[in-house]
């Protein structure tokens, strides 16, 4: 599990909200833009992390749990 700083009243995820102290996002958008939740068909897109949707590009990206890396958070981060 990651370094979420989410308070206990929420249904916790393994990585916090963008802007909180999380592992760097992979598949970076070309420009700063708006993210929303990934559509349901991407429910299992991120193997060890949370999926978020790059609205301008209509593509999914992943915020990896601590200790994982890769476009879909599919690899163990050996440097962690």
């Amino acid at each position: 599990s990651g370094n979420s700083t989410r308070s206990p009243e929420t249904n916790g995820l393994s990585c916090g909200y963008p802007g909180e102290n999380c592992t760097a996002t992979t598949v970076q958008p070309k420009r700063k833009g708006h993210f929303s939740r990934c559509p349901k068909q991407y429910k299992h897109y991120c193997i060890k992390g949370r999926c978020r949707f790059v609205v301008a590009e209509q593509t999914p990206s992943c915020i990896c749990d601590e200790g994982y890396t890769g476009a879909r958070c599919e690899r163990v981060d050996l440097f962690y």
């Epitope: 909200y17 963008p18 802007g19």
Partner: antibody, heavy 119, light 107 residues
Framework: QVQLLESGGGLVQPGGSLRLSCAAS????????MSWVRQAPGKGLEWVSG???????TYTDSVKGRFTISRDNSKNTLYLQMNSLRAEDTAVYYC?????????????WGQGTLVTVSS | SYELTQPLSVSVALGQTARITCSGD??????VHWYQQKPGQAPVLVIY???DRPSGIPERFSGSNSGNTATLTISRAQAGDEADYYC?????????FGGGTKLTVLG
Amino acid sequence: QVQLLESGGGLVQPGGSLRLSCAASGFTFSSYAMSWVRQAPGKGLEWVSGLGHVGYTTYTDSVKGRFTISRDNSKNTLYLQMNSLRAEDTAVYYCARDYLDFGYYFDVWGQGTLVTVSS
Amino acid sequence: SYELTQPLSVSVALGQTARITCSGDKIGKKYVHWYQQKPGQAPVLVIYDDSDRPSGIPERFSGSNSGNTATLTISRAQAGDEADYYCQAWDMQSVVFGGGTKLTVLG
């Protein structure tokens, strides 16, 4: 304790303006997307506007160009500036916290503030 | 624009099972959330992501979503369950609510 408290509602004439505020407490306000949802008397819920933690804004068609959503993270406060008000804007306005980001669900709601547009 | 359709009212006998439906085109491909609202109060989230329950919500509340219909099921209905219930989904960067269903608990 996680809490949202709206204020600023009242009676305003058609064409007038009003600014609603929503004071947040008990959580890291700047980390969440926030929304305004309204409910006309005896009617259902209608989403009005949303604001992401990085400043992205989105509105329902009927308020575009008239309403502006904003936030002041230093004051833990969400705002809704309402201009060119119409009778059909009469409703209880709720401030709601989006779980994580846009596209999730509203896990915390305020108690609402009533806006009445009438001459 | 995307539309969610709910029955205006549903009645259930005390202790029995109530089912409230929410219909929308291919709604099964979207996440659906349910809110309970009692008179004069703010809405409360009772089901999120089709079938998950927030902490503090009784196990009697459950949800399902498939095809063109999402369903909120309330087992062993109690008098305190009498309220308006709204389904909600996300479409094209905007929030969509159903029209709401008034649940009446008889007896």
